[in-house]
Interface confidence: low
């Protein structure tokens, strides 16, 4: 079948990195600069992606594969194939339309991207708070009082104290 197809369509003989040039009697011509063909039998080469502005080049374009972009420092990729770059924030912050904002009290973000998430509610699992949460870290839940052996000192949940100067938003 392949042999028959190639007799009927001479373009099928053109390998990746070339295109079937109708203007030159269907000769396989190399892709021009800044273009590529990742499969054989192509009648045109695709224009290479250019990593501009906030995008930077992770992999250069070759005649057989497109360029791949990532983001300049301070930004991270979003979307398939890094179609967008979004500004990084610090841990303990989230990105809003007005820039990076501190997580509200009772929430945390341990990454430079994404949104602030509520602290784990230890009591839902019948556990107590072993370590307080912060803007950057979730609470650590400890064993429930029932899990403690008789005579052992129970773990008292510390009272949640506001961080100095940090008001809820």
């Amino acid at each position: 079948f392949e042999r028959t197809r190639s007799l009927q369509d001479p373009c099928s003989n053109c390998p990746a990195g070339t295109f079937c040039d109708n203007n030159r009697n269907q000769i396989c011509s190399p892709c021009p600069p800044n273009s590529f063909s990742s499969a054989g039998g192509q009648r045109t080469c695709d224009i290479c992606r250019q990593c501009k502005g906030v995008f930077r080049t992770r992999k250069e374009c070759s005649s057989t594969s497109n360029a791949e972009c990532d983001c300049t420092p301070g930004f991270h990729c979003l979307g398939a194939g890094c179609s967008m770059c979004e500004q990084d924030c610090k841990q303990g912050q989230e990105l809003t339309k007005k820039g990076c904002k501190d997580c509200c009290f009772g929430t945390f973000n341990d990454q430079k991207r994404g949104i602030c998430r509520p602290w784990t509610n230890c009591s839902l699992d019948g556990k107590s708070v072993l370590v307080n949460g912060t803007k950057e870290r979730d609470v650590v839940c400890g064993p429930s009082p029932a899990d403690l052996s008789p005579g052992a000192s129970s773990v008292t949940p510390p009272a949640p104290a506001r961080e100095p100067g940090h008001s809820p938003q």
Partner: antibody
Framework: QVQLKQSGPGLVQPSQSLSITCTVS????????VHWVRQSPGKGLEWLGV???????DYNGAFISRLSISKDNSKSQVFFKMNSLQADDTAMYFC??????????WGQGTTLTVSS | DIVMTQSPSSLAVTAGEKVTMRCKSS????????????LSWYQQKQGQPPKLLIY???IRESWVPDRFTGSGSGTDFTLTISNVHAEDLAVYYC???????????FGGGTKLEIK
């Protein structure tokens, strides 16, 4: 810390060319683009062109026929060349780092006077 | 090319006053994909290169005091300086940097003078 240092001539004759080197430190040219901007005496800022981190360039259409920007990543140098200079090209020329959303660090500027 | 129009071209204020300057673009600088406005503000003092003040229309650079506020979206943008200090004496430029609309262009500048 991040720095961009420019070197180039101060006086050029009409019809001659201008070459400026922008040597950067504190960051890699494989991670950031570098723009060129000029400022004529008493006037505002005019964007001339850019070389992106991957090596591709974009130019202001008004200068595309006589402007060339290139770079040497290993030497952390960006090269700016403008041909066919006339008196109205007299200006301060700056290189500046692209940070995505703005030009966050600028060179000290190269003063060019085009005069015979 | 996108045309950036700044107003007023100059203004003189007394230290401590509030100042508002405007920048209007001939095309929208709002990118619907990420809701970012590709507009920056620069401050240029006499004999110095410009300094990036605000990007994304409203996000202050780390060195910028919070008396500087950028606002606006689409085609209309504002830079406000509340409680002007003597060291704010400078020319302020807006610039579009939407990569889909090359060339990047700057406004004509607003010169801030202190009485």
């Amino acid at each position: 810390q991040v720095q961009l240092k420019q070197s180039g001539p101060g006086l050029v004759q009409p019809s001659q060319s201008l070459s400026i080197t922008c040597t950067v430190s504190g960051f890699s040219l494989t991670s950031y683009g570098v723009h060129w901007v000029r400022q004529s005496p008493g006037k505002g800022l005019e964007w001339l062109g850019v070389i992106w981190s991957g090596g591709s360039t974009d130019y202001n259409g008004a200068f595309i026929s006589r402007l060339s920007i290139s770079k040497d990543n290993s030497k952390s140098q960006v090269f700016f060349k403008m041909n066919s200079l006339q008196a109205d090209d007299t200006a301060m020329y700056f290189c500046a780092r692209d940070r995505g959303g703005g030009f966050d660090y600028w060179g000290q500027g190269t003063t060019l006077t085009v005069s015979s | 090319d996108i045309v950036m129009t700044q107003s007023p071209s100059s203004l003189a204020v007394t230290a401590g006053e509030k100042v508002t300057m405007r920048c209007k673009s001939s095309q929208s600088l709002l990118w619907s994909v990420n809701q970012n406005n590709y507009l920056s503000w620069y401050q240029q003092k006499q004999g110095q290169p410009p300094k990036l003040l605000i990007y994304g229309a409203s996000i202050r650079e780390s060195w910028v005091p919070d008396r500087f506020t950028g606002s606006g979206s689409g085609t209309d943008f504002t830079l406000t300086i509340s409680n002007v200090h003597a060291e704010d004496l400078a020319v302020y430029y807006c610039q579009h940097n939407h990569g889909s609309f090359l060339p990047y262009t700057f406004g004509g500048g607003t010169k801030l003078e202190i009485k």
